[in-house]
């Protein structure tokens, strides 16, 4: 329903934001070493592509009737 | 030759209603879902609703959804839209459009304002 | 809302050159049955706006094979090749994958 999906979007949403931070933190407290700068870009590259993908989750396919006739009225007129 | 024609439109004061019909000819009205988009007075399209074609199924963007219906009667070959509680921001330039966005109607003017 | 990037926002071109118009979306337009419902339109000054291409790269009846769509994911292109006077107007794009269908804020071609 989309009162559930709104509740899962909404988790998942909360959960990125603590998750995000919990890393970040982290990731502060450690030296500013090559290898701490590059798992740092590697966290922020997932949370963004994670942050990306539940954005679409939002956007509801059109309905299937509300597509392309499989025939335009156009072509139906001129046959 | 495939004709949409709107009517209906014209000027309303804010928290009014308007009822928009589209009489079509020229193709088989019953077999197609049905679209109306509209432009505002800065030139942007927006799609504002469809319905399916025996008007069991319908879809709204969500600033018009609890205020505007649309509706057909296949018989009359004609598309509605219902209108209630204008808002200014509702003031456009609306067409009929047949699924697909293939055929367009010439538009019909709406204002809202006091 | 899914957003459609328009550029450039007006063009000038001589007769006979052609002109390319950019679309980009903020996702892709894939939709769960396979296919991308993307589209280009014309609007002529005090007319409806016309459908050109359906379907990223289709042809809508009656337009002239000088019109062309291309592009996947979120690029899409509108490519007229020896453009006439009577392609001026406003270019805009759209999709119709999800809800709520969405355009772009449209391409002025003016001709020289």
């Known amino acids: 329903s989309e009162a559930e999906d709104a509740s899962l979007l909404s988790f998942m949403q909360g959960y990125m934001k603590h998750a995000t931070k919990t890393a970040k933190d982290a990731l502060s407290s450690v030296q500013e070493s090559q290898v701490a700068q590059q798992a740092r870009g590697w966290v922020t590259d997932g949370f963004s592509s994670l942050k990306d993908y539940w954005s679409t989750v939002k956007d509801k396919f059109s309905e299937f009737w509300d597509l392309d006739p499989e025939v335009r009225p156009t072509s139906a007129v001129a046959a | 030759q495939l004709q949409l024609v709107e009517s209906g439109g014209g000027l309303v004061q804010p928290g009014g209603s308007l009822r928009l019909s589209c009489a079509a000819s020229?193709?088989?009205?019953?077999?197609?879902?049905m679209r109306w988009v509209r432009q505002v007075p800065r030139k942007a399209l927006e799609w504002v609703s469809s319905?399916?074609?025996?008007?069991?199924?319908?879809a709204y963007r969500d600033s018009v959804k609890g205020r505007f219906t649309i509706s057909r009667d296949n018989a009359k070959n004609t598309l509605y839209l219902q209108m209630n509680n204008l808002k200014p921001e509702d003031t456009a330039i609306y067409y009929c459009?047949?699924?697909?966005?293939?055929?367009w109607g010439q538009g019909t003017q709406v204002t809202v304002s006091s | 809302a899914t957003m459609l990037t328009q550029s450039p926002g007006s063009l000038s071109v001589v007769p006979g050159e052609s002109a390319s118009i950019s679309c980009k979306t903020s996702q892709g337009l894939v939709h769960s049955d396979g296919k991308t419902y993307f589209y280009w339109f014309l609007q002529k000054p005090g007319q409806s706006p016309q459908q050109l291409i359906y379907q990223v790269s289709n042809r809508a009846s009656g337009v002239p094979d000088r019109f062309t769509g291309s592009g996947s994911g979120t690029d899409f292109t509108l490519k007229i090749s020896g453009v006439k006077a009577e392609d001026a107007g406003v270019y805009y794009c759209a999709h119709g994958t999800y809800y709520p269908h969405t355009f772009g804020s449209g391409t002025r071609l003016e001709i020289k």
């Open positions: 319905i399916h074609t025996d008007g069991g199924g319908t």
């Open positions: 020229g193709f088989t009205f019953g077999t197609y879902s």
């Open positions: 459009v047949i699924a697909g966005y293939s055929d």
